[in-house]
Each structure stands twice: as C-alpha cells, then as structure tokens.
Interface confidence: medium
Amino acid sequence: ELPKPYISSNNSNPIEDKDAVTLTCEPVAENTTYLWWVNNQSLSVSPRLQLSNGNRILTLLSVTRNDTGPYECGIQNSESAKRSDPVTLNVTYGPDTPIISPPDLSYRSGANLNLSCHSDSNPSPQYSWLINGTLRQHTQVLFISKITSNNNGAYACFVSNLATGRNNSIVKNISVSSGDSAPGSSGLSASGSGSGLNDIFEAQKIEWHHHHHH
C-alpha cells in the first residue's frame, strides 16, 4: 500500500519578488505518479512554476502574495492513490504604499488632528510618524489636540517590514487656518488619503534609484 505523502519546503516564509520556493513531495516511491494541487485545483501551467524530478519537486520561481496556497501533493499507482495534508506558505510582502486617512488637507485652528496610517504588509509593519522630517512617534495613529498654525507642515507615515527588510512612506501636507469657515467640500470622495514626498527619507532614495534618477 502507498504511504500517505507529505510536503517538505525549503522556505516556509518566503519574501515576495525575491525568493524561490521548492516544495518536495515525500517520500520517494517507485513506479508512482506524482500529482500537485493548488487551492484545491490541479496545477495549471505558469512560467513561474517548474516541475522536476518526475513531478516530485515543485518550484515557485518567484513568489507573490497570491502564492500562499494551500498546496497538496498526491502519489498514485495502478493500485491506489494517496493525498498529502495541505501546506500553506506564509509569503512575506510589503509594506505597500501607505494610505493616510482621513483625506482632509485643511483644518481649522483649535480642531483635533487624528491621522491614521495603513499599509498592506505581511507581517504587519512598524509605523512611524514624522512631522516636517522630525520623528515624532512609533504608532499607527497620530493624535494632536487643538492644533494651531504651528502644526502646518508635512506629515509623513513611514512603514517598515522587518521580515522583508523593506520600507515605504507617504506624506501629506496639512494646512491649519485660523478662519471661521470650514474648508469646502471637494469633488473627490474617499475613505482615506495621503501623498508622497521623497525628500524626507534619504535612505529610500537608494531604492528609488533602481527605477528613477535625479
């Protein structure tokens, strides 16, 4: 009788766009056919997927966050067939460009400023806030009560993922007015917003220069 197969992996926490992952269907069995399923469907052809060693080894050449699985392998011969337990990959990714909410860019003097930052990332990123280039706090939410014109400036949310070793940032320029009237309604609608200001994060320019130059 065929043994129940199992999957071994060379990397259970791969980094998106960086790592390849090799999944091996164990054990080696003579006169058997190896089969693979991803998300409960038979393996479909993809330039990023490579089968080798008589289909016993499945290689994901460059993982993305969509490649978590689950993965199952099976072995079969003319007598019987057996299927492994599912294996899920913990693909680490991000942090993506953060979004600062709410979208307001203009505030009245005396109002409370309550900014929240979110970035898609696995694992969850570390959040930091900088105001006019100065680090203020390491939290996802920035709260300042009773703001004045002294609080004008560039509010940056900086996110860092220790697992991927990657950082990202976004900045919005906020104006505080002493006028009585609230800013007019915009023709744009959203649940959050932010903006980019590259000059604050010198270290990031190294990353940008792979795609851009000054």
Partner: antibody
C-alpha cells in the same frame, strides 16, 4: 516589460453600462494600487478611481460615485471598471495607470487607453 | 479639491530654444507634483515626479522645479520630438489626484 492593456470600450446609449478591463503584465500586479484615469474629448485628464493592492481600499471621483465600480482580480492580473448609468459627460478615453511604489504615487505606467462614447 | 492651473494652453518655440511650462496649485502640495508628456495619439508618458526627479530614460533637457504652489517644467534645447502636450498632476491628496489642463507645445 511592464504592460497595461485596456479593453471593453465602445459606443453606448445614455443610461447604459460598460465594463472595462485592464490586463497587466511584467510586474507583480498584486503589490500595486491601480487607478483609472480618463481623458475627455477636450483632452482634459481626470482621475476616476483608485483601488489598493489588496482591494480593501477604494476611492472615487465624486461625479462617478454610485455609478462606477473599480475592482481587481489579482489571480488574473486584471483591473476592472464597471460603469453604469452612463452620461454623455462620461465620454472619454479611459486609461488604467499604475502608481509607482516607494513613497511616490505618481503614475509611472499607463495603458494605451480604451475609448468610451456615450451618445443617443 | 486641489486645482492645478496651467495658464498657458499653447506655447510656441523653436528647435534649440528653452521653454518653461508653468503650473499653479490652489493650495500647498509640497513637492508632490508630477509632469507628463502626451504626444498625439499616445497615452501620457511620465517625465518628472516629486517636482524635480526625472524618470529613468527621460532626457536631461527636461527639468522640473518648484514647491508649495508654483511648479515649472523647463525644456532646454527643444527638439522637434518634444512637440506634445504637457500636463502637471498633484498627488498631495493621494490616492485622489488632480491634473492641470495641459499646455500644448508647438514647434515653429
């Protein structure tokens, strides 16, 4: 090479519907927010909608809110714009565009566009 | 919303000249401005981001400058292939964008 290819445009009567698609290749689609931008016959560019990389966050121009729906299928590397209750002022060339990644949301890649004409 | 105003709809210049296209924001947008070039029948091509950074492959005759509310795209030593329309865009309110109305560059 990054490529964005739009399709689904055409001639439609006021009040009608269309679904635009944008097939992406050459980059990890699921890592990027994506946007739709339109260009009117007068050549004015107007941002229409943006969807975050995972699809959790969605943003619209006020004049299309409730009529247009942006969505994505990361498994198929495809961005969509479902347009309903179309008006003559929606006539435009519709582009899908990719905001850049690191702290710079300027749109670094654009598709070739698909034309939408709303006319009776 | 933030209005981006390109006051000159058309500009005429000669090959070899230097020309400046301007864009004014209705409120402070820091340096969160991009410039795009659009040739007839083509989609917009990114030239400049963060007000002054060129995308790779963009000739160094294209220079962006400005911050706050006033921005300029300067093309030095204008070439015939620079015949195009140029648009500014703010993304201080990302992911909500607004564009300028465009400036069409004509070569004499």
């Amino acid at each position: 090479e990054v490529m964005l290819v739009e399709s689904g445009g055409g001639l439609v009567k006021p009040g009608g519907s269309l679904k635009l698609s944008c097939a992406a290749s050459g980059f990890t689609f699921s890592s990027y927010a994506m946007s739709w931008v339109r260009q009117t016959p007068e050549k004015r560019l107007e941002w229409v909608a943006t969807i975050s990389s995972g699809g959790s966050y969605i943003y619209y121009l006020d004049s299309v809110k409730g009529r247009f729906t942006i969505s994505r299928d990361n498994a198929k590397n495809t961005l969509y714009l479902q347009m309903s209750s179309l008006r003559s002022e929606d006539t435009a060339m519709y582009y899908c565009a990719r905001p850049a990644y690191y702290g710079n949301p300027a749109m670094d890649y654009w598709g070739q566009g698909t034309s939408v004409t709303v006319s009776s | 919303d933030i209005l981006m105003t390109q006051s000159q709809k058309f500009m005429s210049t000669s090959v070899g000249d230097r020309v400046s296209v301007t864009c004014k924001a209705s409120q402070n947008v820091g340096t969160n401005v991009a410039w795009y070039q659009q040739k007839p029948g083509q989609s917009p091509k990114p030239l400049i981001y963060s007000a002054s950074y060129r995308y790779s492959g963009v000739p160094d005759r294209f220079t962006g400058s400005g911050s706050g509310t006033d921005f300029t795209l300067t093309i030095s030593n204008v070439q015939s292939e620079d015949l195009a329309e140029y648009f500014c865009q703010q993304y201080n309110s990302y992911p909500l964008y607004t564009f300028g109305g465009g400036t069409k560059l004509e070569i004499k």
